[in-house]
């Protein structure tokens, strides 16, 4: 349905608070370097304009598209050229090219200082002094660091952030109340950002067919009692929501997400028995709850798929008549029966089934040709099962830190050209799969592990795309979305890599090591480990373990010394010399 004024329509649908929050997020995700005050000024101007359009939809400029209105506003920023360089050239373009241009300049790794958490009393004072500004600052800081963060979900995080301060700033022990909540929000926020980044990459790099396939598989696992037509409707709506958010259309995205939540709650009976507790909640919480809802129980008596997808003489006829619908139904039927499989595995199985039909439906005896298609799935299923088993055993044996180190070594040997900070970040996150998934029952391990790894590897792909250095990474990232993880798993030591020259500066440490948090110390040590492997890619596990044990001992010794800096200056070169000898 068309509206005379799109901006008035969205303002009325969303309400002023959500409208302002979403516009702030949109602007912060586009202009990531702009100061907070500049963005607040722009948002206030847009909001005032929207109100004039609500009062009179025929007022001047109220008929313009949101892209035109927002783009015009962004292009009024005086320092655009000096702050953003060639991004300023976007402003010379017309819509829709201008918005596409802004999207292309979103930076997944902006050069912004890490967020430092002030003292609890300082934060509580700021919260009480000006709650609205405090919460806007949160939206701004998160959005500029995570330019693809799912905007309506960020509003939910902001609501939880507000609730945490409202509760804890009145508590007897403010810090004990607040800090765990902030840690939880930070960790959940990073995870949410990474998951959404994969959705956007899926849509932008592989198209909406890839995203729809992912959604069919995931929603069929969640809602195994729902009919295929119902799942298809949800997939269509969900694809629209995420296409809008990934495309920077945050007001439309939030509005459509609210409509989807409304539809799901009005049609619970034909979707899932698990939606009930979500549907009593307020909007932001409701949408979040629906997105995270647990899998419904499988219908009591599902038949084997063999009858319709192997034994039937009509397989090729049905496939030819509507390929995507037939494959979609196959994926739905398989996924609803297999909540124990990762979505990526289900998509590989559907791909294998499609490839078999493409080959066999052109053969002399199609039925004979595809009769064993399900048996061909076995190696595809066993590969992630074995991978999860082996890595969980390794995690249980080593613990998280050493498991991360094993992955650091493994991935540095595979792709040594990748920058050290990226290898450290990605390997540390890959290593978190252990604590996240290995404690789960067998039936939940694979979906947890492989779908989490897909999210982490997408981060590697996104960072690598910005600064490509490895053909292997490019190949794994671009050839097939569903085979990314198996592609990286299959990479071996890069024999063509010329080892990095030894640089003593890289292994020079100072007394500031001693004041670092445990996490920061780990990152320092892991950075050194990556540099060691880049210097000696063929070093054995035992050699590397020896050097790392010596490193830990050297740091511990100097941090206990009276004159720490003198100790580092004296013991450091000895450690470097001993390490070089050990790796020779």
């Amino acid at each position: 349905d068309t509206h005379k004024s799109e901006v008035a329509h969205r303002f009325k649908d969303l309400g002023e608070e959500h409208f302002k929050g979403l516009v702030l997020v949109a602007f912060s995700q586009y202009l990531q370097q702009c100061p907070f005050e500049e963005h607040v000024k722009l948002v206030n101007e847009v909001t005032e304009f929207a109100k004039t359009c609500v009062a009179d939809e025929s007022a001047e400029n109220c008929d313009k598209s949101l892209h035109t209105l927002f783009g015009d506003k962004l292009c009024t920023v005086a320092t655009l050229r000096e702050t953003y360089g060639e991004m300023a050239d976007c402003c010379a373009k017309q819509e829709p090219e201008r918005n596409e241009c802004f999207l292309q300049h979103k930076d997944d790794n902006p050069n912004l200082p890490p967020l430092v958490r002030p003292e609890v009393d300082v934060m509580c004072t700021a919260f009480h002094d000006n709650e609205a500004t405090f919460l806007k600052k949160y939206l701004y800081e998160v959005a500029r660091r995570h330019p693809y963060f799912y905007a309506p979900e960020l509003l939910f995080f902001a609501a939880r952030y507000k609730a945490a301060f409202a509760e804890c700033c009145q508590a007897a022990d403010k810090a004990a109340c607040l800090l765990p909540k902030l840690d939880e929000l930070r960790d959940e926020g990073k995870a949410s950002s990474a998951k959404q980044r994969l959705k956007c990459a899926s849509l932008q790099k592989f198209g909406d067919r890839a995203f729809k396939a992912w959604a069919v598989a995931r929603l069929s696992q969640k809602f195994p009692k729902a009919e295929f037509a119902e799942v298809s409707k949800l997939v269509t709506d969900l694809t629209k929501v995420h296409t809008e958010c990934c495309h920077g259309d945050l007001l439309e995205c939030a509005d459509d997400r609210a409509d989807l939540a409304k539809y799901m709650c009005e049609n619970q009976d034909s979707i899932s028995s698990k939606l009930k507790e979500c549907c009593d909640k307020p909007l932001l919480e409701k949408s979040h709850c629906l997105a995270e809802v647990e899998n419904d129980e499988m219908p009591a008596d599902l038949p084997s798929l063999a009858a319709d997808y192997v034994e039937s003489k009509d397989v090729c006829k049905n496939y030819a008549e509507a390929k995507d619908v037939f494959l979609g139904m196959f994926l739905y039927e398989y996924a609803r029966r297999h909540p124990d499989y990762s979505v990526m595995l289900l998509l590989r199985l559907a791909k294998a089934y499609e490839a078999t039909l493409e080959k066999c439906c052109a053969a002399a005896d199609p039925h004979e040709c595809y009769a064993k298609v399900f048996d061909e799935f076995q190696p595809l299923v066993e590969e992630p099962q074995n991978l999860v088993k082996q890595n969980c055993e390794l995690f249980e044996q080593l613990g998280e830190y050493k498991f991360q180190n094993a992955l650091l070594v493994r991935y540095t040997k595979k792709v040594p050209q990748v920058s050290t900070p990226t290898l450290v970040e990605v390997s540390r996150n890959l290593g978190k799969v252990g604590a996240k998934c290995c404690k789960l029952p067998e039936a939940k391990r694979m979906p947890c592990a492989e779908d989490y790894l897909s999210v982490v590897l997408n981060r590697l792909c996104v960072l690598h795309e910005k600064t490509p250095v490895s053909e292997k990474v490019t190949k794994c990232c671009t050839e097939s979305l569903v085979n990314r993880r198996p592609c990286f798993s299959a990479l071996e030591l890069d024999e063509a890599y010329v080892p990095k020259a030894f640089n003593a500066e890289t292994f020079t440490f100072h007394a500031d090591m001693c004041t670092l948090s445990e996490k920061e110390k780990q990152v320092k040590k892991q950075t050194a480990l990556v540099e060691l492997v880049k210097h000696k890619p063929k070093a054995t596990k035992e050699q590397l373990k020896g050097v790392m044990d010596n490193f830990a001992a050297f740091v511990e010794k100097c941090c206990k010394a009276d004159d720490k800096e003198a100790c580092f200056a004296e013991e450091g070169p000895k450690f470097v010399a001993a390490s070089q000898a050990a790796l020779a």
């Epitope: 008596d301 084997s304 798929l305 063999a306 039936a443």
Partner: nanobody, 123 residues
């Protein structure tokens, strides 16, 4: 601990009948699809027949259709395989298996396996 115990195997003349039983313990029987697989000497294990959790759906390999019948009794935690018109090529060790999640009835979808019972069909 999950246990599947097969019984009812033995030596039978071609054209004769046997009824195999598989008693399950240590699992929620009604939550598992059940299947019978067989392995003849020197050959790979093959699926013979499987039955859905509630018993409403069955899958039969072409080689046994019309001769074998699978059934289950969820109250007794037991699955049965009635084998009629037996042939020498039916000679094999018959394994009972349970699948928490199943789409295809293929071997890799089955989580628990019995030790097997030998069926010998003489000509």
């Amino acid at each position: 601990e999950v246990q599947l115990v097969e019984s009812g195997g033995g030596l039978v003349q071609a054209g004769g009948s046997l009824r195999l039983s598989c008693a399950a313990s240590g699992l929620t029987f009604s939550s598992y699809a059940m299947g019978w697989f067989r392995q003849a000497p020197g050959k790979e294990r093959e699926r013979v027949v499987s039955i859905s959790r509630g018993g409403g759906y069955t899958y039969y390999a072409d080689s046994v259709k019309g001769r074998f019948t699978i059934s289950r009794d969820n109250a007794e935690n037991t699955v049965y395989l009635q084998m009629n018109s037996l042939k020498p090529e039916d000679t094999a060790v018959y394994y009972c298996a349970a699948a928490r999640y199943w789409a295809t009835g293929s071997e890799y979808e089955f989580d628990y396996w019995g030790q097997g019972t030998l069926v010998t069909v003489s000509s």
